[in-house]
Interface confidence: low
């Protein structure tokens, strides 16, 4: 199609022809060249020459690894962009005529910029420390200090900050805190209920035995009357052992004032003051 | 205590191939990164090539080394460095290496080295 | 390939003395720096990693810092035990572990 200036669409071919005047603007995808409105090549073609009078715009399509992304009057396409494996980079998508090939990062790498260019391994988060945000193509790991009652023991690119394990949900309790590289240790509460259990138990068991000796001394005092006056025993003696101890000690018999006392081999011998006398 | 071992280091002539072993004790190659790097006698340390054990398991070449030095995983234990046409200029201690994630990939785990001598 | 240039390549300081050493990337490489110290027949053994962060069991007369393209390593009251050769490193930037040139240290 032969290409007319623009003000004949304006004024009329004759007025031009009168008083010609070269179109200072032309129409979208349109582009002026000696003075006249030339069409631009479309996105996957460039230009070969220039439309005339008489001829149009003429475009052929870009090579194989070649593309033009927008209308033009570009002589020569651009060449894909190459995804240097050596520079971590991998091809995410594959170029067309019309679009330039998209690359980006290996597993484990970022991209350098925005374009691209480069890649760099994701960091890992160091011990006492949590991702806040995973690495991406584009973004490397976003690191945050773990918190009280949070703790991380491993450097990773992945792992948060994990909460301390809550030891009363398993009826456990803390045996050891936790801080921010290592988490709380949980422990049996019998632990702690039997070190407060255990004494009181022993000492109940030393009152029965205390109270026990001494109703048996009481109860082997002699029936008949004797004419003793009435005294308290000023000492009682009770076994070292404690029960459940061995009782298969060797044992004697003595008689003091007619009672029998039973004697433990080794033992010292003790008679109360009232039975002495 | 986890460590590495390299093998394969002899006495060759120009022009000969060689294949370098490293050995991983106690440890295995689980998506991290193994390298080679040498040092010829008297010389500073050179970066010749890392892999990347992982499911990619992309290979990564100083450019002076692309072409005549081929590193891969052999095994869940080992990784290999092939050398093609030597001259004696590869002469040098041969160090199996292992970047770390949590050093930044610093190298935090070195192999003794293993001696490669290319004379006629 | 980044290329990690390090000054100087020797550095003689008394016991109880101070030594610097430079490290500088040929692009930025953000915080992934990592130093190394190497004794001979020995592999080099980890330092400093994410520019200044000591590795577990290293003594902090070792200082690092810096980010970007300029680091430094500060080792103070130097002791005859830190005679040796130390190398920066950029970590798993651009998929690249390229080591500085090295810088020996020794303690008079």
């Known amino acids: 199609m032969v290409r007319l200036p623009l003000q004949c669409v304006l004024w009329g071919c004759l007025l031009t022809a009168v008083h010609p005047e070269p179109p200072t603007a032309c129409r979208e995808k349109q582009y002026l060249i000696n003075s006249q409105c030339c069409s631009l090549c479309q996105p996957g073609q460039k230009l070969v020459s220039d439309c005339t009078e008489f001829t149009e715009t003429e475009c052929l399509p870009c090579g194989e690894s070649e593309f033009l992304d927008t209308w033009n009057r570009e002589t020569h396409c651009h060449q894909h962009k190459y995804c240097d494996p050596n520079l971590g980079l991998r091809v995410q998508q594959k170029g067309t005529s019309e679009t330039d090939t998209i690359c980006t990062c290996e597993e484990g790498w970022h991209c350098t910029s925005e374009a691209c260019e480069s890649c760099v391994l994701h960091r890992s988060c160091s011990p006492g420390f949590g991702v806040k945000q995973i690495a991406t193509g584009v973004s490397d790991t976003i690191c945050e200090p773990c918190p009280v009652g949070f703790f991380s023991n491993v450097s990773s690119a992945f792992e948060k900050c994990h909460p301390w394990t809550s030891c009363e949900t398993k009826d456990l309790v803390v045996q050891q805190a936790g801080t921010n590289k290592t988490d709380v240790v949980c422990g049996p509460q019998d632990r702690l209920r039997a070190l407060v259990v255990i004494p009181i138990i022993f000492g109940i068991l030393f009152a029965i035995l205390l109270v026990l000796v001494f109703i048996k001394k009481v109860a082997k005092k002699p029936t008949n009357k004797a004419p003793h006056p009435k005294q308290e025993p000023q000492e009682i003696n009770f076994p070292d052992d404690l029960p459940g101890s061995n009782t298969a000690a060797p044992v004697q018999e003595t008689l003091h004032g007619c009672q029998p006392v039973t004697q433990e081999d080794g033992k010292e011998s003790r008679i109360s003051v009232q039975e002495r006398q | 205590c986890q460590s590495l071992e390299e093998s394969g280091g002899d006495l060759v002539k120009p022009g000969a191939s060689l294949t370098l072993t490293c050995t991983a004790s106690?440890?295995?190659?689980?998506?991290?990164?193994m390298c080679w790097v040498r040092q010829a006698p008297g010389k500073g340390l050179e970066w010749i090539a890392c892999t990347y054990t992982g499911s990619s398991g992309g290979t990564y070449y100083a450019s002076w080394a692309k072409g005549r030095f081929t590193i891969s995983q052999t095994s869940s234990t080992t990784v290999t460095l092939q050398l093609t046409g030597l001259t004696p200029a590869d002469t040098a201690t041969y160090f199996c290496?292992?970047?770390?994630?949590?050093?930044?990939?610093?190298?935090?785990?070195w192999g003794p080295g293993t001696l490669v001598t290319v004379s006629s | 390939d980044i290329v990690m240039t390090q000054t100087p390549s020797s550095a003689s300081e008394p016991v109880g003395g101070t030594v610097t050493i430079k490290c500088q990337a040929s692009?930025?490489?953000?915080?992934?720096l990592a130093w190394y110290q190497q004794k001979p027949g020995q592999p080099p053994k980890l330092l400093i990693y994410?520019?200044?962060t000591l590795a577990s069991g290293v003594s902090s007369r070792f200082k690092g810092s810096g980010s970007g393209t300029q680091f430094t390593l500060t080792i103070s009251d130097l002791e005859c035990a830190d005679a040796a050769t130390y190398y920066c490193?950029?970590?798993?930037?651009?998929?690249?572990?390229?080591f500085g040139g090295g810088t020996e240290v020794v303690v008079k």
């Open positions: 290496a292992r970047p770390d994630v949590g050093f930044d990939f610093a190298i935090n785990f």
């Open positions: 994410r520019a200044s």
């Open positions: 106690r440890f295995s190659f689980s998506s991290t990164y």
């Open positions: 490193q950029c970590t798993g930037y651009t998929i690249s572990w390229p």
């Open positions: 692009q930025s490489i953000s915080s992934r």
